[in-house]
Amino acid sequence: IWELKKDVYVVELDWYPDAPGEMVVLTCDTPEEDGITWTLDQSGEVLGSGKTLTIQVKEFGDAGQYTCHKGGEALSHSLLLLHKKEDGIWSTDVLKDQKEPKNKTFLRCEAKNYSGRFTCWWLTTISTDLTFSVKSSRGSSNPQGVTCGAVTLSAERVRGDNKEYEYSVECQEDSACPAAEERLPIEVMVDAIHKLKYENYTSSFFIRDIIKPDPPKNLQLKPLKNSRQVEVSWEYPDTWSTPHSYFSLTFCIQVQGKSKREKKDRIFTDKTSATVICRKNASFSVQAQDRYYSSSWSEWASVPCS
Amino acid sequence: RNLSVATPGPEMFPCLHHSQNLLKAASNTLQKARQILEFYPCTSEEIDHEDITKDKTSTVEACLPLELIKNESCLNSRETSFITNGSCLASRKTSFMMALCLRSIYEDLKMYQVEFKTMNAKLLRDPKRQIFLDQNILGVIDELMQALNFNSETVPQKSSLEEPDFYKTKIKLCILLHAFRIRAVTIDRVMSYLNAS
């Protein structure tokens, strides 16, 4: 058993049928010695008396808010949560496996640039009695500061019969140098509490590996005189790290016909302009990626050819 | 073809091309090593990210773009020096061009060159003959060092008579290649910045 925060305790249970559970001793936080009784949650049933209460915690019916009373007045509370260990592996009932970029990915994180700011998000089908808290640091043995904001419900989607909820959080490394070579990964730890179930999820990454630039901006087409060709130009997104000659992007450009089946001709360039043949009803698209480190491509920015 | 992009003319800055080759070679060699050593802890998540140049060179700090000099987090051990020399600086007049930066890159390359050669000598004694560095990566390092044209005392190649632990040597190779790829990215960024200056 360990203390999550004041008066909230997590009992770690080896979770299998007929498991013996864990013996827990609760102590009433009071100078009083006599006439103390204990109850669990809203039930008025007296579980025991005395300054301490010894319980065997085996299942969720044994978890909850234990209160010690004297003369009808509550003296102190202890909330017991359960953390299930199933065959050596902590349970992951609350969050959905996003399976990207690999199986067992519960937290996904992205950064738009090298400033040390990043966003993480996760999915669940649970809609009520759910709280999250997030901590983050650079490295774990001698952690350097990362400050995370409040967790927000960022999206709701219908998936078949189920509703899926996306939560996200923004974090900022306290003293980040965009040009630094990362040696220690960023660690993100999310505590999830659903009713009386406690779970924790972690993700470890280098900012360089989670970079996903915003799409290029100001995408423009300029027809060339006496030619079927068009000069297209675009700019680095505002959110990308500067100077751009140091934090350079590379671009993938394509012309997509009206039909999705039509062969797309893709080309790669480090420049911010190109000459293309842009037929009517087609569209021109461009996406960006760090020129020197192959992290994610941005989403496409598109304009119609006509 | 629907698309065409004009190819740039020859780079004004002679080291840019070499640094691009360096990054390609570093990335390819790392990728190949990860495939060959798939049963060894060789992924970014599994290795310790060591830096053999730590406390010996200060490439990131010495080569900071001017725009980032205002960022206090970037200035931990910044030593600024604006003396210019070395052949890559030919006829370029910008305050960013510091000998310290290019000298630091040169020293990095020299250190990695020695480490890679030492490691290769060990790996060539492995009866499994599982992996060794091809000449490409060593050649590319050499080319950039020549283009930088700094002179420095030669570092003797470490040689050991006792039989190496090949498992440890292969893991060390992974660590080295990951670190070298990261440093190659920095070098390429620096050269690109210098080229634009």
Partner: antibody, heavy 115, light 112 residues
Framework: QVQLVESGGGVVQPGRSLRLSCAAS????????MHWVRQAPGKGLEWVAF????????YYADSVKGRFTISRDNSKNTLYLQMNSLRAEDTAVYYC????????WGQGTMVTVSS | QSVLTQPPSVSGAPGQRVTISCSGS????????VKWYQQLPGTAPKLLIY???QRPSGVPDRFSGSKSGTSASLAITGLQAEDEADYYC????????????FGTGTKVTVLG
Amino acid sequence: QVQLVESGGGVVQPGRSLRLSCAASGFTFSSYGMHWVRQAPGKGLEWVAFIRYDGSNKYYADSVKGRFTISRDNSKNTLYLQMNSLRAEDTAVYYCKTHGSHDNWGQGTMVTVSS
Amino acid sequence: QSVLTQPPSVSGAPGQRVTISCSGSRSNIGSNTVKWYQQLPGTAPKLLIYYNDQRPSGVPDRFSGSKSGTSASLAITGLQAEDEADYYCQSYDRYTHPALLFGTGTKVTVLG
């Protein structure tokens, strides 16, 4: 004490279907994940499928994906395995088992797929 | 086919010590715990070892488990006639959990 009893096995022709049941008793069935494991005659153990305590997530071995469906009825304390498009290589003893460090196995039910 | 490799058979005289190895990789045994089962002919598997080296109550202390890196092993000391059975190791893969990974199985024969 914990008890698991499989039923529903038998002889079936290739391409046909069969539904296995596993009746659980002696524990809070709705709190624990459950597996199906099979063993072909003279061969080793092969995991088939898993279902979470609340039925929210199901996992399958590649060899049965798309043909077999694991399900549970927590009100009846019963685990099921619906087997469609059966093949000769599905011939085996099928066991249900609890998920956890100390697991409990049923006695097994024999499924024979033969023409 | 199984990704946890065991020797097909081991044998020993009564009273001897035999060991069965179970070889995996970094993503399974290297990052998860190992169980060992004993299966007597015509019966369901019986748990012998969990969490690499822990014995459930009722399992004789002649059976012991260990794990090192990407391999695990089961040792039976003071071999007895009733130990003649098939033995299986089991673990998980970090990317496919909760799928159970079983070893190929080892037949233990008690000589004489």
